[in-house]
């Protein structure tokens, strides 16, 4: 039976240029975690391996950091990065745990915007 | 197997600047955050800064900013930490520990660094 | 920066009691927190990742618990070997931390 729950950052807004840390975090089971994917819908963007350690896939490569933990860090963002990102946690014995984060990166003058005019 | 090696011990004088070293083996050198930890006199631990030698991408504590260069050399396997304008609250044992999918799973015995006339 | 406190930051016992070791984290760091034993004049020895993942190699009298900002390390019948200090360490955001230790030491 799987026990375990996955907590994400959930919905999150970023800055066209900027950089952000996708997290999630795996509780509530004893189950073994061997390793954690992390893909942007059906994209593949990092894998960390119990035995082989962090694989960026080379696509991402000059805008993808590893961490912090078992984080993700994207950086340089354009507006072609919203949407949705998904953590793949695999476990054993529980098998497959799942957390998706979604991401939208704002137009630099629209986020200035959106924060000049905030109601109080 | 997986080996950090560091050299046992380093004696410099104050003022001066030292690079330690921390040669990795029997993993992808490239696929890991390794992290450089400092400890005085058997006391606590202090989080100085990492480098992932896949990209050379670094991270500092503020504290250590200014007195610290983490650099790595990908032919050898090995990286460095670079300490300039050493003082006596300099000495003290200095780690290099390997991160991967269980935290720091792989530490190097440690330099002794004495700073000293 | 995350700060961690650990208590208490000395406990004296008898080997085959067991213990528990206390580390909380200010402010919530989910699970990111790893629990590390040191002997004297050696380096750190991961025992517990991620606040409850166990380790190969490490005895199973060692388990790890909580979330968020309280976190538990417990030792089970404890053995003379397993004297000596203990750390923990949040890795949910850089700068990493470390706490500020504690020494279990014989009765």
């Known amino acids: 039976m799987m026990t375990g729950t996955i907590e994400t950052t959930g919905n999150i807004s970023a800055e066209k240029g900027g950089s952000i840390i996708l997290q999630c975090h795996l509780s509530s089971t004893t189950a073994q975690v061997t390793q954690v994917n992390w893909e942007q819908q059906d994209q593949l963007l990092a894998i960390c391996n119990a035995d082989l350690g962090w694989h960026i896939s080379p696509s991402f490569k000059d805008r993808v950091a590893p961490g912090p933990g078992l984080g993700l860090t994207l950086q340089s963002l354009t507006v072609n990065d919203t949407g949705e990102y998904f953590c793949i946690y695999h476990t054993y014995p529980d098998g497959t745990y799942t957390g998706r984060i979604f991401l939208e990166v704002l137009e630099s003058s629209v986020a200035e915007h959106g924060a000049r005019f905030q109601i109080p | 197997q997986v080996q950090l090696q560091q050299p046992g011990s380093e004696l410099v004088r104050p003022g001066a600047s030292v690079k330690l070293s921390c040669k990795a083996s029997g993993y992808t050198f490239t696929s890991y955050w390794m992290h450089w930890v400092k400890q005085r006199h058997g006391q606590g631990l202090e989080w100085i800064g990492n480098i992932y030698p896949g990209s050379g991408t670094t991270n500092y504590d503020e504290k250590f900013k200014s007195k610290v260069t983490l650099t790595v050399d990908t032919s050898s396997s090995t990286a460095y930490m670079h300490l300039s304008s050493l003082t006596s609250e300099d000495s003290a044992v200095y780690f290099c520990?390997?991160?991967?999918?269980?935290?720091?799973?792989?530490w190097g015995q440690g330099t002794t660094l004495t700073v000293s006339s | 920066d995350i700060v961690l406190t650990q208590s208490p930051a000395t406990l004296s016992v008898t080997p085959g009691d067991s213990v528990s070791l206390s580390c909380r984290a200010s402010p919530n760091i989910r699970n990111s927190l790893h629990w590390f034993q040191q002997k004297s004049h050696e380096s750190p020895r991961l025992l517990i990742s991620y606040a409850s993942q166990s380790i190969s190699g490490i005895p199973s009298r060692f388990s790890g618990s909580g979330s968020g900002t309280d976190f538990t390390l417990s030792i089970n019948s404890l053995e003379t070997e397993d004297f000596g200090m203990y750390f923990c360490?949040?890795?949910?955001?850089?700068?990493?931390?470390f706490g500020g230790g504690t020494k279990l030491e014989i009765k």
């Open positions: 360490q949040q890795s949910n955001s850089w700068p990493y931390t």
């Open positions: 520990t390997r991160e991967g999918l269980y935290a720091f799973d792989y």
